[in-house]
Interface confidence: low
């Protein structure tokens, strides 16, 4: 806590300028009026204050706005944002995308800090949903942002926002997240033609059900192995050898290299060996000829 001391004669700050760099902590506390600071916040970011001096300026703003800073101040915080705690940020009401961008810019190139996570949370909650512009902004700064959300949070993403999602934004998403995002993507891209549709939907296919994969297999999409390996195992298992062959097209040869890995391994175990042999890839582990194939899922449903 900085002690309350009188401002020395002639040192009272008339404006926020470079002369304040030479003020000691107690002088800043005594000689800078908090209201003046609030109205000239845009200047603070352009003056090379030390981080210790910034602590004093923050303290002054905290005293002026105990209930939380107004957006006019927040937008111009600049590097002072790095001094804020999540508790400080929870008091804010940030509604402008420009304010969000200005503060994300300060943290650019760094991992998402607790401060940034809290800021984003406050912003999204204030908007009620993750609209396209917000998602565009967040994924531009943090490509992994979408996959940091819970399935419940993702449910508030409107299908129109899916257009802002790039393949790399989904790299770290797990199947539960893709389960939520896939139907939204399907809806968002539904009016596109076959090949264009596949290009857009490809990154989301980790959430696709069997019937959609069967439909895709009829469209000459030539899915690559990397995409196939990310499909839900339960969605791949019911596919026939012919359907997988059509789905992968020329990439079907890649199954051999992946035959020990899921979902290929589990799929092979469900296919007749005769059918697998038609691929000419030497895939082994299918059901030998003459054996009865029980559909266990149907059996469970009946019992």
């Amino acid at each position: 806590e900085v002690e309350k001391t009188a401002c020395p004669s002639g040192k009272k700050a008339r404006e926020i300028d470079e002369s304040l760099i030479f003020y000691k902590k107690w002088e800043l506390e005594a000689c800078v009026d908090a209201a003046l600071l609030a109205t000239q916040m845009d200047r603070v970011n352009a003056i090379p204050f030390t981080y210790e001096q910034l602590d004093v300026l923050k303290h002054k703003l905290d005293e002026l706005y105990p209930q939380g800073y107004p957006e006019s101040v927040i937008q111009h915080l600049g590097y002072l944002f790095l001094k804020m705690s999540p508790e400080d940020i929870r008091k804010w009401n940030v509604t402008s995308l420009e304010t969000l961008k200005a503060l994300l810019e300060v943290n650019k190139g760094h991992e998402m800090s607790p401060q940034v996570a809290t800021l984003i949370d406050r912003f999204v909650k204030g908007r009620g949903q993750l609209d396209k512009d917000t998602l565009d902004t967040l994924t531009a700064f943090y490509p992994g942002y979408l996959c940091s959300l819970s399935p419940e949070e993702l449910s508030s993403v409107p299908p129109s926002s899916i257009w802002a999602v790039r393949p790399q934004d989904l790299d770290t998403c797990d199947p539960r997240q893709l389960d939520v995002l896939y139907p939204k993507a399907r809806l968002a891209f539904q009016n596109m033609n076959g090949s264009e549709y596949f290009v857009k939907i490809q990154s989301f296919l980790g959430g696709a059900p069997t019937e959609d994969l069967k439909a895709l297999s009829q469209q000459n999409v030539s899915m690559d192995l990397a995409t196939f390996m990310k499909l839900r195992t339960d969605a791949v298992l019911p596919l026939t050898v012919a359907e997988v062959q059509k789905l992968l097209g020329p990439h079907v040869e890649g199954l051999k290299a992946e035959e020990r890995h899921r979902p290929v391994r589990d799929w092979i175990l469900r296919q007749r060996q005769d059918d697998l042999d038609t691929l000419g890839l030497g895939l082994q582990g299918g059901i030998p000829n003459g054996y009865l194939v029980l559909d266990l899922s149907m059996q469970e449903a009946l019992s």
Partner: nanobody, 120 residues
């Protein structure tokens, strides 16, 4: 610890131009804002221009429109392009870099200075 080395100073006629630069080495990750100060006398130190990590600039009124500060974050170097020089710009120019881990009494790393002399 951060070391700052200035270069580019010299003598020039009024109305001429000079570009001075300052290269940082050592624990450069600890650098925040960087700026140029000038010492007219031993006791008077005046900020000329500064640029923070975000690229925001600030100029003393006396040099606005004539001097341009820039920064190359990849090379940890700050430059000061001085145009339309005046005799009153004559001074020793010092480079300063903020120590973001500052806890003690000195918040800045300082260079050794480079002399700029402008004759009429």
């Amino acid at each position: 610890e951060v070391q700052l080395v200035e270069s580019g100073g010299g003598s020039v006629q009024a109305g001429g131009s000079l570009k001075i630069s300052c290269a940082a080495s050592g624990s450069v990750i600890d650098i925040g804002a960087m700026g140029w100060y000038r010492h007219i006398t031993e006791k008077e130190r005046k900020l000329v221009a500064t640029i923070n990590a975000g690229g925001n600039t600030y100029y003393a009124d006396s040099v606005k429109g004539r001097f341009t500060i820039s920064r190359d974050n990849a090379k940890y170097t700050v430059y000061l392009q001085m145009n339309s020089l005046k005799p009153e710009d004559t001074a020793m120019y010092y480079c300063a870099a903020e120590d973001i881990n500052y806890t003690g009494t000195e918040a800045y790393y300082w260079g050794q200075g480079t002399q700029v002399t402008v004759s009429s």
